[in-house]
Each structure stands twice: as structure tokens, then as C-alpha cells.
Amino acid sequence: VTGSRVYPANEVTLLDSRSVQGELGWIASPLEGGWEEVSIMDEKNTPIRTYQVCNVMEPSQNNWLRTDWITREGAQRVYIEIKFTLRDCNSLPGVMGTCKETFNLYYYESDNDKERFIRENQFVKIDTIAADESFTQVDIGDRIMKLNTEIRDVGPLSKKGFYLAFQDVGACIALVSVRVFYKKCPLTVRNLAQFPDTITGADTSSLVEVRGSCVNNSEEKDVPKMYCGADGEWLVPIGNCLCNAGHEERSGECQACKIGYYKALSTDATCAKCPPHSYSVWEGATSCTCDRGFFRADNDAASMPCTRPPSAPLNLISNVNETSVNLEWSSPQNTGGRQDISYNVVCKKCGAGDPSKCRPCGSGVHYTPQQNGLKTTKVSITDLLAHTNYTFEIWAVNGVSKYNPNPDQSVSVTVTTNQAAPSSIALVQAKEVTRYSVALAWLEPDRPNGVILEYEVKYYEKDQNERSYRIVRTAARNTDIKGLNPLTSYVFHVRARTAAGYGDFSEPLEVTTNTVPSRIIGDGANST
């Protein structure tokens, strides 16, 4: 039965004389008069079994003490730590030249754990042990005793076990403690790889290469390897493991992210708190779920807050300039927590009588700088029809708008374009021609661009070539031009006027008055 004593983690004790309860019962030769097992009290008044010999009076001492069989446990090199006290020969009463101040340490490898006798010639000498000057002061009972500590190593060993022997040649010595141990590199976790208990190599310079295995919930980044040095220290860690997604390193383990935390990738990062407006309800989350009404865009990193579509733009102002409209607005009060806000313009052309009957403006309308994806809060819309009702909607959008389309995201304004000069009249006809007059009629312009206030008819004799012309104005779409010369070619132009001004004149209509007092009715532009 052995009591527990604490030693370094990299040492595995095979024998500790101080931990043995009761007698050690090692074999001495000679049986009497040589090594003697003696119990002394330690500082806790606990008996320590020691071996002592002090045959300093007589010459030619050869006293052997052999331990019990010590199992090797797979170790190729073992260490022997001896704590002893050795009397200075000068301090001994009546002693002359027979006294020695050294003893010898031996070992013998054997597969037999029951050898009863000491055969000196079987033993191999490890070293001669002398007391050095570096004493350890140890309390033995109420007395301080100077203890020497010497450590020797032996190897490579190959048999199942071995015996140690101590040869006294005439010293006054007490073996207070004998400990035999081997060194191992203790089980350790380095870079999230576990390396098993590894017995050191056979010689004092050997390095044992050991491959590590990733701890639970981790994966190899590079193959983890370490070297077990002869002194039981792990050396030169190579490679590492990384905690899987949803796990982080804590105390050398990969532990699941706590509730409210997440980790998206296998990295050496720690779990992060769920971004704003998101949550995790389980341990080990690899991402966090967005709160109700919040979303994450496809290209948003898991680390980004969940966001929502923006509210409607504010303070939409319109400025109509004839058939153009300039719109300006303010950013939404709530951008949804995103930076990627942009604006889309929707243009609808609405009937004057029923504003609800609107339809898309079509491709003829132009937008500066653009209709969709506007980054600025203004747009200029051109090529509208004059004197027309338009409704413009400004939509605020961001990267998550598509997940929750909501009318609240737009603001609208309805405008009527200004009256503009009308377009030219497409068709002018001579309805009746006489010697002295021409009756003209025409159609309303294609694009009146407002209320037609009047029409202006310009005419002149063809050979005068507009050097001298006359103007007739009428509110109707027809008029009689009188006071003309017979048999004369006249050129007629008609244009319409709105409050915004005159439109372009129509294409010329050439008409020749008659020579006889009869009517000629024509409907072409060039009646003769």
C-alpha cells in the first residue's frame, strides 16, 4: 500500500520508498551487520522507512542492498532520485582511514520479479554517488537534517523490469528516500489538439513525434503535431485545429456558443453576441435569427445587424416647368439600419376627369440622373406632356426591401404640367374658293398643350414670297379670307395659340383664286 505524494505531471513514479506503508523489506547482503532498515520520524511525526549503514571502523566493507523488482511500464529510460544523508568522515569518533564518503549505485534488468538473492556480478554500475555541497535542509522530527539529492538515469531498458542495488564500501550513510520514475510528456491540449501521454525516448536527446487529434467540435486546419522531449516537455507545436462553427475555445475545449451568441465559421474567433435585432435560442448557433420584421440580405454577413426596409421619404417637393418636373425629397426618418438606401421613381399619367384612372407614363419620359437606384434625393423628369395630370411616387428601397414590400415606403405627389405652345396643325383645307375669297378649315393640333385661345392665319401672294403678308385671327377652326385678287396664287399658314404662346405654323397651303364669279370647292392643301 502506498500513500499519495505529489510529483510533477511529467514524472511517473515506479517506486517511492517514502510512500510505502510498513517495512520496505529489501534484501541486504550480508543479512546482518550491513544495511539496516530503520524507521525515523518525519516533520509530521510520520515514520519514514530508511536504510542506513555506518560500518566506518572496519576496512574492506562490501554491503549490498537490493530493492524489490521494479516494473518498467514501457519506459526505456528511468531516473533514480536518491535522498540521503552522508556523514563527513572527519566528524566520526575514533575513525581513521577506513571511512568512505561515497556509495555505488547499480541496476540489473530482469523479467523475473522474484529473485531472492543478490548476485553481484549480474549488476551493472550506474555511478558512484558522493555527497555534494548543495544540501537540502529537511525537517526530520524537530531536527533539521542535511539531505543530499542525487538523480541518475539509466537506459535504454528492454526487459519487463529491473532491480536497483546500493553498494556501501565503508560510508556512514542513510538512504532517506529512493524514488524511481520515468518521464512522460503528459496528456495535453495545445492549439485545440489533444496529445496523449507519451513516454519519452530511449536516450536523453531523442524527440518522439506525436500526432494530435482535434478536440470535440473542432476540425484540423493543419495536421497537429508535437515532439515529446527527453525531459518530458512538449516541444515545437506544429499545426492546429479550429473550433467548428457554433463553437469557441474555452479552457482548451471547443464549447458551444451560449444562447444569444453565434459563430458562423470554423475559425479561431470567439463566439460573437448576436447582432442587433437578431437572436439565438439554442446553444451552438452558427447564425442568429432576425427579429420579426427584420431581415438579412443575401450578401449580408452573419455579423451584420438584421435590418428592415426604410420608411417613406419625407418632404417631397415638386417644381413644374412646362413639360418637365423637378422633384426633391428628404431621406426617410428610418433607414432600416442600412446604408444601401436608394430611390425609385414611378411615373403615372392620370386622366383629368378621373385621377384614379392612371397608367404608366411609358418610355417617352426621361429621368435625370436615372429612374431607379437613385442615390441622390432629387430627380428631373422631362419630355412630359403639357397640361397633363401626373402622379409621381418616390420609393425608398434598401437591401431588404424585397423581403417586405410595403406601400408605406413611398411618398407621392400629383402635378399638372404647364400649358405649352401647341403643336403645329397637321391639315389645312380650302373648303371654298371664289374670285375674291377662300374659305379655310383645319383640325386641332395633335398636342394642344393647353386651351386653344385662337388660331392665326397668315397669307400672302405667292410671288410676294412672304415679303408682304396679312394676318387673320379666329377662335374657330375655320375662316373666310376675303378681299383677294382674282386669278392670284396665295399661300396660307395656320397656327394655334394657347396661353403659353403660338405653336408652329402648319405646312403651306397654296390656293389660286378664280377668274369667273363661280365657286370652286377644294379640300386639298394646294387647291387651284
Epitope: 544523508t85 569518533p93 581513521m96 526530520i140
Partner: antibody
Framework: QVQLLQSGAEVKKPGASVKVPCKAS????????MSWVRQAPGQGLEWMGW????????TYAQGFTGRFVFSLDTSVSTAYLQISSLKAEDTAVYYC??????????????WGQGTLVTVSS | EIVLTQSPATLSVSPGERATLSCRAS??????LAWYQQKPGQAPRLLIY???TRATGIPDRFSASGSGTDFTLTISRVEPEDFAVYYC????????FGQGTKVEIK
């Protein structure tokens, strides 16, 4: 058993000599030094010195040189204390004692019963 | 020569009581000190060596401590057979005895 046997009391006249034997038994005589201790009547103990039983080499304490001689006869495992030119102040019990030397310290672990030497005219 | 001074010269105790004897050296003797017991008409008996190691057969009510110049012998519970004279003896440099302490019945 281990024991030291001394001779009986001696009465001597001043100027005479006395040889006190100390016979060892029960152990190897030459393995332990032998010490001599004096105790005058009603007084304390006084260490006189020792002799290496292996080599016969003696060591004398201060005040015990000249008239005092330690000797051996290893063949009969006996140590001797000889005092010459006895004086009245030499009257005392003389003890032989085995010197036990250990790694932890020394001590006189086995004692003879003592020999009373009386010097009187 | 190293002088050992024992105190008190006489210690009166009742059986069962604790007795503490002191021995002081004129210079350090390290742990090289022994204690002896002597009863009237008998040879001394080795009790302690090495300042604190009990000799073979000595009851554990006897204990000793000290190092350097100050040493103590303690009898935890004095028995009737313990009434005697006690001597300390140093073997650090030559050998000398203290003058003794007499433990008598109170």
C-alpha cells in the same frame, strides 16, 4: 545480548597504578569505538576519550593526557583503561561505553556497570 | 572547548505532568547532541542522539528538539521510573557533557 562487563571496585594508594578492563560481548568488538567516562562521587559525567577498536588508535580529552592510557586486546574483545600515578582526585567510577555511530548522529548506546576506583592512603 | 549549560539544575514535577529540560551550548554544535538518563547507582542510558532521534527501546514520551545552540528534552507525561538525572552531551567538537538536571518528585 550486547553487554560490557567491567571489573569490581579497586582501592589504590596514591602513586600506584590501576588497569580497568572492559569486556565486550554480543557484537563485533572491532566494529565500534570504545569510549571512557569518569564520574566523581556526587558529580556529573566527564568524557575522557575513546579508542578505535580496529586500529587501536586512542583519542584523549583535555585533562586526560599523560597518566591515562587506553589499550585493547582484540583477541578477548577487551578494552583497558590504565591510570598511573594515581591521585586522590582520581577517585571516581570509571565507565566504558560503546560508541554507536549512525548517519543521524552518535551516542554511547551500551555502558559497562562502572568500576569504582578509590585512591586513598 | 564547548561548554554545555543545563537548566534548571533541579526540576520538581508530579507523575503525569510534563517535564521540559533545556541545554544550551556555548557555540553551535549543529545537531550533534545526545541526551542520557542516569539513575542512582546505575550507568547512564542513551535516550536521544542526533538532537532528536530516539535510541532503540526508548518510550515515545521522550522527545527532543533543537539545533545549533538551544536544545530541549521533553517528557510528555512523567512516569515514576523517569525520576533521575538527565545529561546532555555534544559531539560536534571533542565531546563534553552538561552538568545535569535532576528531575525529582514534587
Amino acid at each position: 545480548q550486547v553487554q560490557l562487563l567491567q571489573s569490581g571496585a579497586e582501592v589504590k594508594k596514591p602513586g600506584a597504578s590501576v588497569k580497568v578492563p572492559c569486556k565486550a560481548s554480543g557484537y563485533t568488538f572491532t566494529s565500534y569505538a570504545m569510549s571512557w567516562v569518569r564520574q566523581a562521587p556526587g558529580q556529573g559525567l566527564e568524557w575522557m576519550g575513546w579508542i578505535n577498536t580496529n586500529t587501536g588508535n586512542p583519542t584523549y580529552a583535555q585533562g586526560f593526557t599523560g597518566r591515562f592510557v587506553f589499550s585493547l586486546d582484540t583477541s578477548v574483545s577487551t578494552a583497558y583503561l590504565q591510570i598511573s600515578s594515581l591521585k586522590a582526585e582520581d577517585t571516581a567510577v570509571y565507565y566504558c561505553a560503546r560508541v554507536r555511530t549512525t548517519p543521524y548522529g552518535d551516542g554511547m548506546d551500551v555502558w559497562g556497570q562502572g568500576t569504582l576506583v578509590t585512591v586513598s592512603s | 572547548e564547548i561548554v554545555l549549560t543545563q537548566s534548571p539544575a533541579t526540576l520538581s514535577v508530579s507523575p503525569g505532568e510534563r517535564a521540559t529540560l533545556s541545554c544550551r551550548a556555548s557555540q553551535s554544535v549543529s545537531s550533534n547532541l545526545a541526551w542520557y538518563q542516569q539513575k542512582p547507582g546505575q550507568a547512564p542510558r542513551l535516550l536521544i542522539y542526533g538532537a532528536s532521534t530516539r535510541a532503540t527501546g526508548i518510550p515515545d514520551r521522550f522527545s527532543a528538539s533543537g539545533s545549533g545552540t538551544d536544545f530541549t528534552l521533553t517528557i510528555s507525561r512523567v512516569e515514576p521510573e523517569d525520576f533521575a538525572v538527565y545529561y546532555c552531551q555534544q559531539y560536534g567538537s571533542s565531546w563534553t557533557f552538561g552538568q545535569g538536571t535532576k528531575v525529582e518528585i514534587k
